[in-house]
C-alpha cells in the first residue's frame, strides 16, 4: 500500500476512534413524529452536552441534559421546562435565566410544594400569610420555607394568626403546589413574556436536599421555526413534514450520530383532514349519517322481516291454492311461485356494510380505548395550577360530550356501525369478519402513535399509568419519546390554553374531566388565555 | 455546622504541580459553589474560580485559566486546586470559602476553610 | 474587570471611636458589596452582605451603606479586637474582585 493511501488510512482510523459514528436511517410518513435518539452518554463521568444540526448548516440547538425525568418543549408558549412524575425531591425554588449557565443573571422562575411532603415553598412570606399565619390545613403540618433575596430561608410560624388568608392556592401565581407523580410545566417568566428563543438555564433550589440538575438549552438562528420536544438524548419533532426531511446530527462529547430523516409525503385530502380538527366535522357528520342509515337499514330489515313473515304464513296456509307462473323477464324475483317476496342475496349488503364500517372504523378504530390508561392511573388531565378565580372553578374549561356522536371518541365502545350492520348476521356474507379498508391506513392517528390499544391521546405524556401514577415505573425517555406528543402543537394549546382548572385538594380520579380534556385538545381556537390574573399558562401539571 | 477543612502546607519546585483538596462537611456538598482565593503574604486576595459540585460546572478567573484546574468528589465532599507550571510567584495561602446555590445570585462568603500554604522554592 | 478601590490603606484608630471604611468600584454593582474582616493568620470573615445585611454573629457595632459604586463600612465603637485588614467583595460579576484592604490598627 502506498504511504499516502496508509497515512491516510491511519488518519481516518484515528479519527474514527476520536469520534466515533453511529448512522440512523429513519423512514416515515408526513404527519408522524420524528423521535431522532443521540448516542448514550459514557456511563461513569457528567452527562455531555449535547448539540443537534442539520444538514450542512451549524448548530442549531445546544443542550446540557441534566437530570433524568426531565425534559424541554419548544413551542409557541416558549422554552417550557417538563418534570415528570414529581416527587418530594422536587419540590422547591426554579430559578432560570435566558442566558447561559456561567453567567449571573438568575431571576426567580416558580416554587414547586409538593402536596404531602412537610414543605411549602413560597417566593414572598406574604403569600404565607401574615406573621404566624398558617396556610389552611397543609401548612400546619408543613414547614415553610420563603426566598431570602439570594437563599431559602427556613419561615417561623408563630403560634398566633391574624389574618388566616384561606387555601393553598391563595398565593403568588408564581407558586404551585402539586400532587406527587404529575408532570409539571414551567416557563422562564409569565407567558407570553416568557423566554422563547434561548439561551435559557434552570436551576433547583432545595434548602435541605440535593438539589436536581436541571437543563440549559440554547436555540441558535439556524434553529427551526417549530415545536421540538427534548427528553434526554431524544429530540421529537411532532408532525413532520417535508421541510424536515434531511440529515441531523448530534454531537455529544466525541461521539456523534448521524440521523437521516425521509419523509413520505401523504395527499392533499389527508391535509385537509388533518388541518386544525378539521377531521370533526366530517367524522361528526359520517357519524350521524351512519346512525340514521344504520336505523332506516334496522326499520326496513324489520319491516322487510314481518311482510316476509306474513306472506309466508300466508303461502303456507293449507287453504290457499299455489299455481305456476312464468316469470316476467327483468329483474324480478326469479321466483316459479307468485306470492313469494325476494330474499337478499347473500353478498348483497356487504359491499356497503364494509364502505361504511371502513369509514367509521377509520375514524375510530385507531384510538382504540383512550380512557384505559387514564382510569387506571386516576385524573391524569387534570390541571394543578394555582390560584384561579371562583368563576374558573365552574370547570367552563370541560364541556360534557353532548351527543352520542361525541362521546364514541372517548367511551369504550364497540364499534357502533359494526353493531348496527350486522345485526342481522344472516343477510351478510362474513358478519364476524373485521371490515377492512381505510382504517387498515390508520388514517386519522399520527403514524403509530395509536398502535398500541391502551395508549394514551393527550401528549406530552404516554403510557400514563407507568409514568405519571405516583407509584409508576422510572421514566425512560428512550422508552417513552417514541409516542410523545403525538397531537399536532395547534391541539397541544388546548392543553396548555385551557382555563385554569383548580384540581382538589383531595386526590382522587375525576374520568369524565378527564374525557372533557381530551376534547378541549382539539380546540385550538378557542379563548387565548389570559395571562394576567392567573397567569399560570406556563405550567400545566397533570395527576 | 459547616465545616470546610484544607490540606496541609505544600513545599514544591518551580515547575512542578500541585494539589490541594477542601474537604467539606455540615452541609449537602452538591448544593453550593465551592470558590478558592489566593492570597500572597503580605497583600490582598484575589478570586481564583469556583466549581459547582452538583454539575462539576465550573468558572475560573481569566488571570487563572491555564494555571489552576478546579475538580470535585461527590463522594467524598471534596473538592480540589491543582496548579501546574509552579513559579515563585504562585506562592501563597489558598482559600477555599463555601459559595451560593447554583442558580441564585449569592455572591458572598460565609464559610471559609483554614488555607493552604505552598511555597515555591528550589 | 471591575476594580475594587479602598481607602484609607490604614487607619489607626483609639477604642471608642467611630471609624467609616471606603470602598468605590469602577462601574456600579448595585448593592453587590460584601465586607470581610482578617486578622492575623486568619481566614477572612464575613462583616456585611449586599452593602448594608447584618450577619448573624457579628456585633452590632458594625454597619454597612452605599449602592452603586460607593460603599462605606463604619464601626460605631472601636474594640481592641476590631484590629485587622477589612476587604470589600464585588459580587456583581465575575470575576470576583477584593479590594486592596484597608488595615485597621489601635492607636
Known amino acids: 500500500m502506498p504511504p499516502p493511501l496508509l497515512l491516510a488510512f491511519l488518519l481516518f482510523l484515528t479519527l474514527g476512534r476520536v469520534r466515533p459514528q453511529k448512522l440512523l436511517q429513519v423512514e416515515m410518513e408526513e404527519g408522524s413524529d420524528a423521535v431522532l435518539p443521540c448516542l448514550q452518554d459514557p456511563p461513569d463521568g457528567p452527562p455531555e452536552r449535547l448539540i443537534w444540526s442539520r444538514d450542512s448548516q451549524g448548530p442549531f440547538l445546544e443542550l446540557s441534559p441534566g437530570s433524568p425525568g426531565l425534559g424541554i418543549h419548544v413551542g409557541r408558549l416558549g422554552i417550557l421546562l417538563l418534570i415528570f412524575n414529581v416527587s418530594n425531591e422536587m419540590g422547591g425554588f426554579y430559578l432560570c435565566q435566558p442566558a447561559p449557565p456561567s453567567q449571573q443573571a438568575w431571576q426567580p422562575g416558580w416554587t414547586v410544594s409538593v402536596e404531602g411532603s412537610g414543605e411549602l415553598f413560597r417566593w414572598n412570606a406574604s403569600d404565607l400569610g401574615g406573621p404566624g399565619c398558617g396556610l389552611g390545613n397543609e401548612s400546619s403540618s408543613s414547614q415553610p420555607y420563603v426566598w431570602d433575596r439570594d437563599h431559602p430561608k427556613e419561615w417561623d410560624m408563630g403560634p398566633a394568626c391574624a389574618s388566616p388568608r384561606g387555601d393553598l392556592n391563595q398565593s403568588s401565581s408564581l407558586d404551585l403546589t402539586v400532587a406527587p407523580g404529575s408532570t409539571v410545566w414551567l416557563s422562564c417568566g409569565v407567558p407570553p413574556a416568557s423566554v422563547a428563543t434561548g439561551p435559557v438555564s434552570w436551576a433547583h433550589i432545595h434548602p435541605t436536599k440535593p438539589n436536581i440538575l436541571l437543563p440549559s438549552l440554547n436555540l441558535t438562528a439556524e434553529s427551526p421555526a417549530r415545536e421540538m420536544w427534548v427528553l434526554g438524548p431524544v429530540l421529537m419533532l411532532p408532525q413532520v413534514t417535508a421541510v424536515d426531511a434531511g440529515m441531523y446530527v448530534c454531537r455529544r462529547g466525541n461521539l456523534t450520530t448521524e440521523i437521516h430523516v425521509t419523509i413520505t409525503v401523504r395527499p392533499a385530502i389527508w391535509h385537509w383532514l388533518q388541518r386544525k380538527s378539521g377531521w370533526i366535522v366530517p367524522v361528526v357528520a359520517l357519524l350521524y349519517l351512519i346512525f340514521c342509515l344504520g336505523c332506516l337499514v334496522s326499520f326496513l330489515h324489520l319491516r322487510r322481516a314481518l311482510i316476509l313473515r306474513r306472506k309466508r304464513k300466508r303461502m303456507t296456509d293449507p287453504t290457499r291454492r299455489f299455481f305456476k307462473v312464468t316469470p316476467p323477464a327483468g329483474n324480478g324475483a326469479q321466483s316459479q311461485y307468485g306470492n313469494v317476496l325476494s330474499l337478499p342475496t347473500p353478498t348483497s349488503g356487504t359491499g356497503r356494510a364494509q364502505r361504511w364500517a371502513a369509514s367509521l372504523g377509520g375514524a375510530a378504530a385507531p384510538y382504540g380505548h383512550p380512557l384505559s390508561d387514564v382510569q387506571e392511573a386516576g385524573a391524569a388531565g387534570s390541571r394543578s395550577l394555582p390560584r384561579a378565580s371562583p368563576e374558573e372553578e365552574e370547570g367552563e374549561a370541560y364541556e360534557e360530550p353532548d351527543s352520542e356522536a361525541d362521546s364514541e371518541f372517548y367511551e369504550n365502545d364497540s364499534n357502533p356501525a359494526q353493531d348496527q350492520l350486522s345485526q342481522d348476521g344472516s343477510g351478510y356474507e362474513n358478519p364476524e369478519e373485521e371490515p377492512s379498508g381505510p382504517e387498515d391506513d390508520d388514517s386519522f392517528s399520527n403514524a403509530e402513535s395509536y398502535e398500541n390499544e391502551d395508549e394514551e391521546l393527550a401528549p406530552p405524556v404516554t403510557r400514563t399509568a407507568d409514568f405519571l401514577s405516583p407509584h409508576g415505573s422510572a421514566w425512560d425517555p428512550s422508552r417513552e419519546a417514541v409516542s410523545l406528543g403525538s397531537q399536532s402543537y395547534e391541539d397541544m394549546r388546548g392543553i396548555l390554553y385551557a382555563a385554569p382548572q383548580l384540581r382538589s385538594s383531595r386526590p382522587g380520579p375525576s374520568y369524565e374531566e378527564d374525557a372533557d380534556s381530551y376534547e378541549n385538545m382539539d380546540n385550538p381556537d378557542g379563548p387565548e388565555p389570559a395571562w394576567g390574573a392567573g397567569g399560570h399558562g406556563g405550567t400545566w401539571s397533570t395527576r | 455546622q459547616v465545616q470546610l477543612q484544607q490540606s496541609g502546607p505544600e513545599v514544591v519546585k518551580p515547575g512542578a504541580s500541585v494539589r490541594m483538596s477542601c474537604k467539606a462537611s455540615?452541609?449537602?456538598?452538591?448544593?453550593?459553589?465551592i470558590h478558592w482565593m489566593k492570597q500572597r503574604p503580605g497583600q490582598g486576595l484575589e478570586w481564583v474560580g469556583c466549581i459547582y459540585p452538583g454539575n462539576v460546572n465550573s468558572n475560573y478567573n481569566e488571570k487563572f485559566k491555564g494555571k489552576a484546574t478546579l475538580t470535585a468528589d461527590k463522594s467524598s465532599s471534596t473538592a480540589y486546586l491543582q496548579l501546574s507550571s509552579l513559579t515563585s510567584e504562585d506562592s501563597a495561602v489558598y482559600f477555599c470559602?463555601?459559595?451560593?446555590?447554583?442558580?441564585?445570585?449569592?455572591?458572598?462568603?460565609?464559610?471559609w476553610g483554614q488555607g493552604t500554604l505552598v511555597i515555591v522554592s528550589a | 474587570d471591575i476594580v475594587m478601590t479602598q481607602s484609607p490603606a490604614t487607619l489607626s484608630v483609639t477604642p471608642g471611636d467611630r471609624v467609616s471604611l471606603s470602598c468605590r468600584a469602577s462601574?456600579?454593582?448595585?448593592?453587590?458589596l460584601h465586607w470581610y474582616q482578617q486578622s492575623s493568620h486568619e481566614s477572612p470573615r464575613l462583616l456585611i452582605k449586599y452593602a448594608s445585611q447584618s450577619i448573624s454573629g457579628i456585633p452590632s457595632r458594625f454597619s454597612g451603606s452605599g449602592s452603586g459604586s460607593d460603599f462605606t463600612l463604619t464601626i460605631n465603637s472601636v474594640e481592641p479586637e476590631d484590629v485587622g485588614v477589612y476587604y470589600c467583595q464585588n459580587g456583581h460579576s465575575f470575576p470576583y474582585t477584593f479590594g486592596g484592604g484597608t488595615n485597621l490598627e489601635i492607636k
Open positions: 470559602a463555601r459559595g451560593g446555590y447554583y442558580g441564585s445570585s449569592y455572591s458572598w462568603f460565609a464559610y
Open positions: 462601574q456600579s454593582i448595585s448593592d453587590f
Open positions: 455540615g452541609y449537602i456538598f452538591t448544593n453550593h459553589y
